[in-house]
Interface confidence: low
């Protein structure tokens, strides 16, 4: 008798590994014999598709070599014209051992930046990714994180982060390891020990020391008054990523000596500079040599301080006056990084106007010194504490800064703006009045040696500082 089809063995979920065989069984009882068709995700599987084998009158579907794209719902449908068609469905879950699809690569990174080592994986179940540094599992912390993708992100890279890394992808079917990659951390050149300034007698020998570090180890070059050192001998030694350079000089004239440490990061260079002055005790150059010329300021350090297009005096006792004076200011400004926010802008204005003095053009270009009142205002109001410390260090022979040797004028020797208003230069950036001074906490035990008047503010001022208003 004719009998409608009945599926006696419903399809079940099949787990299969990639490249292995997977079989679905769809046992059917019926008369006459049914026609059995198969679908994957509701799309008909064609009988002639060579990736499949359909046997046992269609009751057996075999996937000959499973691919990860084969996962889905497989259904068999049986129909013999008696009654309705019957269907049974089951899922194929493609299991896959972990595979690293984008392995990490060697990375060179500058200290302080962010490094990312890629590690993209595939597998089913989804692999968990961990990292090994050297021989130990890598611990995550506030800087170091394994991202969702498996990549390793290191914020604010430190020297200690350098080393060999590999990622590990793991699931229930197995483990995959990436090749070992190297994270190299490069560090900008930095001066550990700056050369010290010296005041020596004519004909002395002086050795200037400069120590620097960085990764790769920097090279050190010496500059004398803006030019490469022409005389003197240089000795160098390198130990534990620290380079020590010693420049021995026979002193016949004063000079500004700059140690420049440089290292290379890819196509870019990083540079650190430190300068020292060599002055000669009782050195007095003949007046005819002590000349200079007027020129517009073209440097960077004093841009915000000097009036726009200011004419400044460039001292030709330096081989390259612009470079030498700029270096002097640069070095002095570095000293100012540690002073109070009240003192710093005032001291910067004083330094810039003292080293790049206003220039009076004429047959003989003449530098115009700062007015005494402004100098005293900086010394005894804005920077009283700092000045006291500096003078104390000077007396004890501890102070080796450009700020002392070249960059700070002796206020009492400067002309007063009350004597001849054209004989001295005013600092437009020190704009304060008596009201401010009244509220300003006393910083000195002694009174100013000159009354500080209401100083006129200048229209060219690019910022103003009052002792009661901190600027950083």
């Amino acid at each position: 008798l004719p009998k409608a089809p009945v599926i006696t063995t419903p399809l079940e979920t099949v787990d299969a590994l990639v490249e292995e065989v997977a079989t679905f069984m769809c046992a059917v009882e019926s008369y006459p014999q049914p026609e059995i068709s198969w679908t994957r995700n509701k799309i008909l599987i064609k009988l002639f598709d060579t990736r499949y084998s359909i046997r046992e009158n269609g009751q057996l579907l075999t996937i000959l070599s499973v691919e990860d794209s084969d996962d889905g719902i497989y259904c068999c449908t049986a129909n013999n014209g008696v009654g309705g068609a019957v269907e049974s469905c089951g899922a194929l879950q493609v299991k896959m051992k972990p595979k690293i699809t984008r392995p990490p690569i060697n990375v060179k990174i500058i200290e302080g930046l962010k490094a990312v080592l890629p590690c993209t994986t595939m597998g089913n179940p989804k692999p968990s990714v961990s990292w090994i540094k050297g021989d130990s599992p890598l611990r995550e912390n506030s800087r170091i994180a394994v991202l969702e993708s498996g990549s390793l992100r290191i914020h604010n890279v430190q020297k200690e982060d350098a080393g060999q890394y590999r990622c590990v992808a793991k699931n229930s079917l197995g483990t995959a390891y990436s090749k070992v990659v190297k994270l190299e951390v490069e560090v900008f050149a930095r001066i550990l020990r700056a050369p010290e300034s010296h005041n020596v007698t004519f004909g002395s020998f002086v050795t200037l020391h400069c120590t620097a570090t960085g990764i790769p180890v920097p090279t050190i070059t010496w500059i004398e008054n803006g030019n490469a050192v022409s005389s003197g001998s240089i000795q160098e030694s390198v130990k534990d990523r620290v380079i020590d350079s010693r420049l021995q000089l026979f002193i016949t004239k004063p000079g500004l000596y700059t140690c420049i440490a440089t290292n290379k990061h890819g196509e870019k260079f990083s540079t650190a500079k430190a300068a020292a002055t060599i002055s000669i005790a009782e050195w007095s150059k003949p007046q005819k040599d002590n000349k200079g010329y007027c020129a517009q300021y073209r440097g960077e350090v004093c841009n915000a301080v000097l009036a726009k297009d200011a004419l400044v005096f460039l001292n030709t006792s330096y081989a390259d006056p612009e470079e030498a004076q700029e270096l002097l200011v640069h070095t002095a400004w570095n000293e100012l990084k540690v002073v109070s926010p009240v003192c710093r802008p005032a001291a910067e204005a004083l330094l810039c106007n003292h080293i790049f003095q206003e220039c009076s053009p004429g047959v003989v270009p003449t530098p115009i010194p700062i007015c005494r009142e402004y100098c005293l205002a900086v010394k005894e109001l804005f920077c009283a504490k700092e000045w006291l410390v500096m003078e104390e260090k000077t007396h004890r022979g501890l102070y080796r800064s450009e700020m002392h040797l070249l960059s700070v004028p002796e206020c009492s020797k400067l002309p007063s703006m009350h004597w001849d208003p054209t004989a001295c230069a005013r600092l437009p950036h020190l704009d304060y009045n008596k009201e401010n001074l009244k509220t300003f906490p006393p910083m000195t035990s002694s009174k100013p040696s000159v009354d500080i008047p209401n100083l006129p503010s200048s229209s060219s001022s690019s910022f103003s500082v009052s002792p009661t208003y901190s600027m950083t």
Partner: antibody, heavy 118, light 112 residues
């Protein structure tokens, strides 16, 4: 300053393959992900995929079966191929640099319009 | 895929007035490292998109400080403190947490 420039045919026939190239100038192609993003007229942005300079790729699953990306570091170029195109693939195609320091597309090309039509 | 939803889709603003655009993600964009993987882009008329804000709240270089990004997890906001005529265009949020990166449908800012 790094600049990106897309190039390729503006008209592609249905069922054919769309091919675009992005040229990186003013900087190195190394150490970045390079991305393709498209925008059908009057619609939003769709991320197509990205390629790293080593050649490894990530594609949008919705386009994965049709997308191929490649990179030629010697020419500072990367390319997109999209096969079996239909009218739905008509869009402005942008190449962009994915800066993984900022996790963002920081530099974009000006875009090239591709029309799929017979 | 992570679905990004922006509101409003259209935003008429008077110059000088503030503006605010909301973006919501279908799952949290806050990673355990503390960063929110959400970027904001502006596409001015006839131009390609340009980056405004990355990692939720960091202004890209050259972006005026009237633009600010805030929010965490699934809810984010782009604020313009004082809208200028040059700010018109379509603003998109984008999640950078997962592949595929997905964008919001865009908010069209126009001047009243």
């Amino acid at each position: 300053q790094v600049q990106l420039q897309e190039s390729g045919p503006g008209l592609v026939k249905p069922s054919e393959t769309l091919s675009l190239t992005c040229t990186v100038s003013g900087g190195s192609i190394s150490s970045y992900y390079w991305t393709w993003i498209r925008q059908p007229a009057g619609k939003g942005l769709e991320w197509i995929g990205r390629i790293y300079t080593s050649g490894s790729t990530d594609y949008n699953p919705s386009l994965k079966s049709r997308v191929t990306m490649s990179v030629d570091t010697s020419k500072n170029q990367f390319s997109l191929k999209l096969s079996s195109v239909t009218a739905a693939d008509t869009a402005v195609y942008y190449c962009a640099r994915y800066n993984w320091n900022d996790d963002a597309f920081d530099i974009w090309g000006q875009g090239t319009m591709v029309t799929v039509s017979s | 895929d992570i679905v990004m939803t922006q509101s409003p889709l259209s935003l008429p603003v008077t110059p000088g007035e503030p503006a605010s655009i909301s973006c919501r993600s279908s799952q949290s964009l806050l990673h355990r490292n503390g960063y929110n993987y959400l970027d904001w882009y502006l596409q001015k008329p006839g131009q390609s998109p340009q980056l405004l804000i990355y990692l939720g709240s960091n202004r890209a270089s050259g972006v005026p400080d009237r633009f600010s990004g805030s929010g965490s997890g699934t809810d984010f906001t782009l604020k313009i403190s004082r809208v200028e005529a040059e700010d018109v265009g379509i603003y998109y949020c984008m999640q950078a947490l997962q592949i595929p990166h997905t964008f919001g449908q865009g908010t069209k800012l126009e001047i009243k």
